[in-house]
């Protein structure tokens, strides 16, 4: 049981570290003037993570990750035609 508990904790800890490293990567992109500038929503700003309150770091990192995933799917669909974003018209092109 203890091993299982440790496994769960380690997994959770790894996810947190992954999220933090993703945040740092995104922060470096922002510093270069690329990442964070592309996004949806009026309340979505492009401030580097370091300027924000640490409480919001996970939410912010996750929202940027979601944004990246959305853009990747879009690019794959419109420039690569590999991902079919079809809800009602599946297979229709």
């Amino acid at each position: 049981r203890r091993d299982v508990a440790h496994g769960i904790l380690n997994e959770a800890y790894r996810k947190v570290l992954d999220q933090l490293s993703a945040g740092k990567h995104l922060q470096s992109l922002v510093a270069r003037g690329v990442g964070g500038s592309l996004g949806g929503g009026a309340g979505d700003d492009a401030e580097p993570l370091s300027k924000r309150h640490s409480d919001g770091i996970f939410t912010d990192s996750y929202s940027r990750y979601r944004k990246q995933m959305a853009v990747k799917k879009y690019l794959a669909a419109v420039l690569g035609k590999r991902y079919k974003q079809r809800v009602k018209n599946k297979g229709r092109r």
């Epitope: 500038s37 853009v71 794959a76 974003q85 079809r86 018209n89």
Partner: antibody, heavy 112, light 109 residues
Framework: EVQLVESGGGLVQPGGSLRLSCAAS????????MTWVRQAPGKGLEWIGF???????YYATWAKGRFTISRDNSKNTVYLQMNSLRAEDTAVYFC??????WGQGTLVTVSS | DIVLTQSPSTLSASVGDRVTITCKSS???????LAWFQQKPGKAPKQLIY???TLASGVPSRFSGSGSGTEFTLTISSLQPDDFATYYC??????????FGGGTKVEIK
């Protein structure tokens, strides 16, 4: 016939607003990515942004804050709201489905 | 800023010529998601190639695309009268969405 038709373009004063529409016929737009692209007179193509099937919009750096993309699936129409317009926004604005079906474009002229 | 540079900007050629247009990106194109478009005056762009090398539906086989990473090429094996137009490359970037090249005008020599 499957086609996209943009409308809403015209002459607007600097600082003004305009809402462009992109209506589809012969196809249900609701499950497609819709993209807006513009082209200044005699210039190249410039990507503005896109909206996904869920209604989330994403923008080019320069467009964010002034331009808003939305969709009304019941009307089979996508919109581009443009605020605080400048002379350099003068262009033909195109909407495109998946970048493989394009409208004919609508001209927006920003001038006093 | 990401820059897609097309060369040449203008190309004078004759019917039957083999034509090559190059598109160079300042950053690696995500997934090699690069497309080529043809545009004629007063008309909307038409997609010719997607995924760097896949021919779009209905596009003649004389058009072909190649390349990866930061360098891509559009080739027209034997130029036809209908091919005189302006060609644009468009690359995909996770950080910036889509960027278009400056265009290459193919005109009659």
């Amino acid at each position: 016939e499957v086609q996209l038709v943009e409308s809403g373009g015209g002459l607007v004063q600097p600082g003004g607003s305009l809402r462009l529409s992109c209506a589809a016929s012969g196809i249900d737009l609701s499950s497609y990515y819709m993209t807006w692209v513009r082209q200044a007179p005699g210039k190249g193509l410039e990507w503005i942004g896109f909206i996904d099937a869920g209604g989330s919009a994403y923008y080019a750096t320069w467009a964010k804050g002034r331009f808003t993309i939305s969709r009304d699936n019941s009307k089979n129409t996508v919109y581009l709201q443009m605020n605080s317009l400048r002379a350099e926004d003068t262009a033909v604005y195109f909407c495109a489905r998946d970048l493989d079906l394009w409208g004919q474009g609508t001209l927006v002229t920003v001038s006093s | 800023d990401i820059v897609l540079t097309q060369s040449p900007s203008t190309l004078s050629a004759s019917v039957g010529d083999r034509v090559t247009i190059t598109c160079k990106s300042s950053e690696s194109v995500y997934g090699d998601y690069l497309a080529w478009f043809q545009q004629k005056p007063g008309k909307a762009p038409k997609q010719l190639i997607y995924d760097a090398s896949t021919l779009a539906s209905g596009v003649p086989s004389r058009f072909s695309g190649s390349g990866s990473g930061t360098e891509f090429t559009l080739t027209i094996s034997s130029l036809q009268p209908d091919d005189f137009a302006t060609y644009y490359c468009a690359g995909g970037y996770v950080s910036a969405g889509v960027a278009f090249g400056g265009g290459t005008k193919v005109e009659i020599k």
